[in-house]
């Protein structure tokens, strides 16, 4: 069964900078990736970036740079302009879509005990919701 993993990392040198890493574990090719924060895509989350494997990326503040790391993983750099570092308590979600086979989404956040520069373990945190025939979690 395909899975999505999410890691959130605080930069050691810039405490206001975070990077979200997401990857897809499974067969098939990815047609689109969406990254959101504050909840899952289409369920209260706010869009941060959309990445197409061939046609480029689109991103919205506070996203700074979205890019493909491999054919099945992406990274999103975020710049936190606020002094209170709200990213530390925020949930980030990544959805990998493979048309028309299905889409898979997981969420993750920076662990409360994280030291700067340490990343969260790559454990997928499935979003539980009513299943929809091609949306697998």
């Amino acid at each position: 069964t395909p899975e999505v993993w999410v890691q959130v990392q605080m930069e050691a040198t810039e405490l206001s900078s975070f990077t979200v890493h997401c990857g897809f574990l499974g067969p098939g090719s990815i047609s689109l990736v969406t990254v959101s924060w504050g909840g899952p895509d289409g369920a209260g989350g706010t869009k941060l970036a959309v990445l197409h494997p061939e046609l480029g990326t689109r991103q919205w503040a506070p996203a700074r740079q979205a890019r493909w790391e491999t054919q099945s993983s992406i990274s999103l750099a975020l710049e936190d302009s606020g002094a209170s570092s709200p990213f530390a308590n925020t949930t980030f979600c990544c959805k990998f879509a493979s048309f028309p086979e299905g889409s898979w989404e997981s969420c993750g956040s920076l662990p409360p005990s994280s030291d700067p520069g340490l990343s969260a373990p790559p454990t997928p945190v499935p979003i539980l919701r009513a299943d929809h025939h091609h949306h697998h979690h």
């Epitope: 689109l32 289409g42 369920a43 197409h52 046609l55 689109r58 879509a97 889409s103």
Partner: nanobody, 121 residues
């Protein structure tokens, strides 16, 4: 979460017509385009049969221009595809999808289970 439900597919003779409908519900729509897609035979990427973006720009695949018409119903979350002068090569599973525009093309982010269109000669 998103629920995109298509209807209107079926079997028809060449030259006939069908009207596909799509209703989106339970969806906090944050994309910028919607459309009808098919998995084109022999192609790795999806083919946008007919798409419409938030600015009202409509785009058709060359193979359906002049025969198919995409339109919104009463509200943003109802989409139609009027298919006229159908040909056997139009036979496929048709998916209603919401997505994002890249380079003028709508790329699906969410889609329904599809509705089968079969055109016999």
């Amino acid at each position: 979460h998103v629920q995109l439900v298509e209807s209107g597919g079926g079997s028809v003779q060449a030259g006939g017509s069908l009207r596909l409908s799509c209703e989106a519900s339970g969806y906090s729509y944050s994309g910028d385009c919607m459309g009808w897609f098919r998995r084109a035979p022999g192609k790795e990427r999806d083919e946008g049969v007919a798409t419409i973006d938030n600015a009202g720009r409509i785009k058709y695949a060359d193979s359906v221009k002049g025969r198919f018409t995409i339109s919104h119903g009463n509200g943003k979350y109802i989409l139609y595809l009027q298919m006229n002068s159908l040909k056997p090569e139009d036979t496929d599973m048709y998916y209603c999808a919401a997505g994002w525009t890249f380079g003028g093309n709508c790329s699906p982010a969410d889609w329904g289970q599809g509705t089968q269109v079969t055109v016999s000669s």
